[in-house]
């Protein structure tokens, strides 16, 4: 058996002493000594710490500006920190949400294969042979070509990865 | 000031189970780990186990293991120890107390630095 | 587990005297010891730790030494509170043992 090496999880070494940390939501007012506790103190409105700490400190809030086109998912806590995202049609430009931008549409050839997210910008695909997109958009799939058969009518154009197929009356002379 | 104040005094018989209470005040209950110890009449202190108030952790001594239970409830500040199985030598005052762990001359070593009031548990037919 | 031994278990003193108590570790706990004191009917209270280190507020008739396996307590001069049982415990592993105890009676 070891003798013990340090101080315990939630304990910080000062002055001889092993002190307990503050608790998530709270800051470090003063450490404690051989005859008091570790002092703390809940966080101010608007602030917070989201881990046993001794900061002398709380952190801000973050602010969802909305001039960057950010909105507030979810409110902070004296624990957690605010969550931005988004205004609709638009995504944040890293994982911290600092900024949004508007969300890529798919150009003709190409198909949404992802819609985006407030977090994610839209994924696209190219359309596959049987499959077009004539327009540029943030929703729409590729569409597959019209089967002529089907409305007894015949190719009369091919289909592109842009453009549908067309199609016409069968030529009668050729029974 | 740091406080641990334990429940009333309990009488049980044989094979029955007693569950006794330690509310901390003064201090932050999930920072320091607590220690949970008896004492026969007449005898020396016995250490039972601890627990981690914080995740709950807990370690039993082996002459405890499978009849003790070391629980907490952080919303209130409160460690419990229940005991299954008594005998009538677990005849003995309860005690938990507050482990405070110190660094001196280069090495730490842990001590009990507040102790509660004691809890008499008689354990007779 | 660490088996620790006290000497005397008890032992009859006057006011005034002075008292050693002795302490034996079954290994090497370098200086991992800490002393109690308790009172009739009331919880322990740490007197000294580690080995010699002497908490603030505890009296300076109160000292203590050695390390490895042979420690001791000494009080110069006997008051009317000192009067109880002194404990020794090992702080090296888990789980902490402690001496049989000693008692201080009034002779």
């Known amino acids: 058996p070891e003798p013990p090496t340090a101080c315990r999880e939630k304990q910080y070494l000062i002055n001889s002493q092993c002190c307990s940390l503050c608790q998530p939501g709270q800051k470090l007012v003063s450490d404690c000594t051989e005859f008091t506790e570790t002092e703390c103190l809940p966080c101010g409105e608007s602030e917070f710490l989201d881990t046993w700490n001794r900061e002398t400190h709380c952190h801000q809030h973050k602010y969802c500006d909305p001039n960057l086109g950010l909105r507030v998912q979810q409110k902070g806590t004296s624990e957690t920190d605010t969550i931005c995202t988004c205004e609709e049609g638009w995504h944040c430009t890293s994982e911290a949400c600092e900024s949004c931008v508007l969300h890529r549409s798919c150009s003709p050839g190409f198909g949404v294969k992802q819609i985006a997210t407030g977090v994610s910008d839209t994924i696209c695909e190219p359309c596959p042979v049987g499959f077009f997109s004539n327009v540029s958009s943030a929703f729409e799939k590729c569409h597959p070509w019209t089967s002529c058969e089907t409305k007894d009518l015949v190719v009369q154009q091919a289909g592109t990865n842009k453009t549908d197929v067309v199609c016409g009356p069968q030529d009668r002379l050729r029974a | 000031q740091v406080q641990l104040v334990q429940s009333g005094a309990e009488v049980k018989k044989p094979g029955a189970s007693v569950k006794v209470s330690c509310k901390a005040s003064?201090?932050?209950?999930?920072?320091?780990?607590m220690y949970w110890l008896r004492q026969a009449p007449g005898q020396g202190l016995e250490w039972m186990g601890w627990?981690?108030?914080?995740?709950?952790?807990?370690n039993y001594a082996q002459k405890f293991q499978g009849r003790v239970t070391m629980t907490r409830d952080t919303s209130i500040s409160t460690a419990f120890m229940e005991l299954s199985r008594l005998r009538s030598d677990d005849t003995a005052v309860y005690y938990c107390?507050?482990?405070?762990?110190?660094?001196?001359?280069?090495?730490?070593?842990?001590?009990?630095?507040?102790w509660g009031q004691g809890t008499t548990v008689t354990v007779s037919s | 587990d660490i088996q620790m031994t006290q000497s005397p278990s008890s032992l009859s003193a006057s006011v005034g005297d002075r008292v050693t108590i002795t302490c034996r570790a079954g290994?090497?706990?370098?200086?991992?010891l800490n002393w109690y004191q308790q009172n009739p009917g009331k919880a322990p209270k740490v007197l000294i730790h580690?080995?010699?280190s002497l908490p603030s507020g505890v009296p300076s008739r109160f000292s203590g030494s050695g390390s490895g396996t042979d420690f001791s307590l000494t009080i110069s001069s006997l008051q009317p509170e000192d009067f109880g049982t002194y404990f020794c415990?090992?702080?090296?592993?888990?789980?902490?043992?402690f001496g049989g105890g000693t008692k201080v009676e009034l002779k």
């Open positions: 107390a507050r482990e405070k762990p110190r660094y001196f001359d280069s090495f730490y070593y842990y001590l009990m630095d507040v």
């Open positions: 003064g201090y932050t209950f999930p920072g320091y780990y």
């Open positions: 627990i981690n108030p914080d995740s709950g952790d807990t």
């Open positions: 290994q090497n706990i370098s200086r991992h």
């Open positions: 580690p080995a010699s």
């Open positions: 415990q090992q702080s090296y592993s888990t789980p902490p043992t």
